[in-house]
């Protein structure tokens, strides 16, 4: 299970760190990310970072997204049972999910910064 982001990281800083990490992942894709594993295409607008974390938690052996998982763990301040959103019915490749999560994160950052 990914460990928590260091306690001193405030939400705006953690969000910026997430954007940096996701940008690095999207730019560094020389080979298929996480062996083209598939994850649930969750509704980020409804479920936020907790839904993203839940979706990515199903991938256990991909070093490339470990830091993303750790940052998401720090940004998600709900228990798993509190995440109330309709269950997804579509799976997408991790690379596509990361791109979607990056766009969502940047939008949040620009609105809230």
């Amino acid at each position: 299970t990914p460990g928590p982001v260091r306690r001193s990281t405030s939400p705006p800083v953690a969000l910026r760190e997430l954007i940096e990490e996701l940008s690095n992942i999207t730019q560094d894709q020389k080979t298929s990310l996480c062996n083209s594993s598939m994850v649930w295409s969750v509704d980020l607008t409804a479920g936020g970072f907790c839904a993203a974390l839940e979706s990515l938690t199903n991938i256990s052996s991909c070093n490339a997204i470990h830091r993303t998982q750790r940052i998401l763990n720090g940004l998600c301040n709900q228990k798993a049972s509190d995440v109330a959103s309709s269950p997804p019915d579509t799976k997408i490749e991790v690379a596509q999910f990361i791109s979607k999560l990056l766009n969502y994160s940047k939008q949040l950052f620009r609105y809230g910064h």
Partner: antibody
Framework: EVTLRESGPGLVKPTQTLTLTCTLY??????????VDWIRQPPGKGLEWLAH???????RYNPALKSRLTISKDTSKNQVVLKLTSVDPVDTATYYC???????????????WGQGTLVTVSS | DIQMTQSPSSLSASVGDRVTISCRAS??????LNWYQQKPGKAPKLLIF???KLHSGVPSRFSGSGSGTDYTLTISSLQPEDIATYYC?????????FGGGTKVEIK
């Protein structure tokens, strides 16, 4: 080629509203990740950031001037407009618009600037 | 707001000299530091973004370094066309803020 061009009244009377227009060439504010900032520079002094607007109409202002500033865009004309109300002689400055891009990291770096338009506030 | 302090406010150096300009932020800006060059009567131009990334078309004699609150712009070999005022700007936190500028002159 990316260029920006500011236009303004040149001279404004105190208490009036200053309206500045920035016309964009070589890029469109309807394109994802594009943004435009306004910055001003009083004669012989440094730079002060005023406001910016993103392609999806997210707007941010300098809190010191927020109550007097309004930024908007007209995508069809590829223009960004800045309004500054209740002007005072201390608002005399060269006003610049500049492009910022949020692809990848959001650096808030202004990569292309207009030539600037000098605005004098005087009765 | 984050305060940006540049030093020196002005300097005079000879052609070929190595020139360094310092910029200090009032708090950690996590490398979100940009440098601009402004020649008399002209608009500023982006030189370096995110501490050390050279903007396209900028000569390689310009470089940037630093972290946390302290950053430096270096001109490895000053050229006559480098006469200008240089500004740092933090992009970590809104409102965006600029340093007071460093005027570079040729001896």
């Amino acid at each position: 080629e990316v260029t920006l061009r500011e236009s303004g009244p040149g001279l404004v009377k105190p208490t009036q509203t200053l309206t500045l227009t920035c016309t964009l060439y070589g890029f469109s504010l309807s394109t994802s990740d594009m943004g435009v900032d306004w910055i001003r520079q009083p004669p012989g002094k440094g730079l002060e950031w005023l406001a910016h607007i993103w392609w999806d109409d997210v707007k941010r202002y300098n809190p010191a001037l927020k109550s007097r500033l309004t930024i908007s865009k007209d995508t069809s004309k590829n223009q960004v407009v800045l309004k500054l109300t209740s002007v005072d002689p201390v608002d005399t400055a060269t006003y610049y618009c500049a492009r910022t891009v949020s692809s990848g990291y959001i650096y808030y770096a202004m990569d292309y600037w207009g030539q600037g338009t000098l605005v004098t506030v005087s009765s | 707001d984050i305060q940006m302090t540049q030093s020196p406010s002005s300097l005079s150096a000879s052609v070929g000299d190595r020139v360094t300009i310092s910029c200090r932020a009032s708090q950690d800006i996590r490398n979100y530091l940009n440098w601009y060059q402004q020649k008399p009567g002209k608009a500023p131009k982006l030189l370096i973004f995110y501490t050390s990334k050279l903007h396209s078309g900028v000569p390689s004699r310009f470089s940037g370094s630093g972290s946390g609150t302290d950053y430096t712009l270096t001109i490895s070999s000053l050229q006559p066309e480098d006469i200008a005022t240089y500004y740092c700007q933090q992009g970590n936190t809104l409102p965006l803020t600029f340093g007071g500028g460093t005027k570079v002159e040729i001896k």
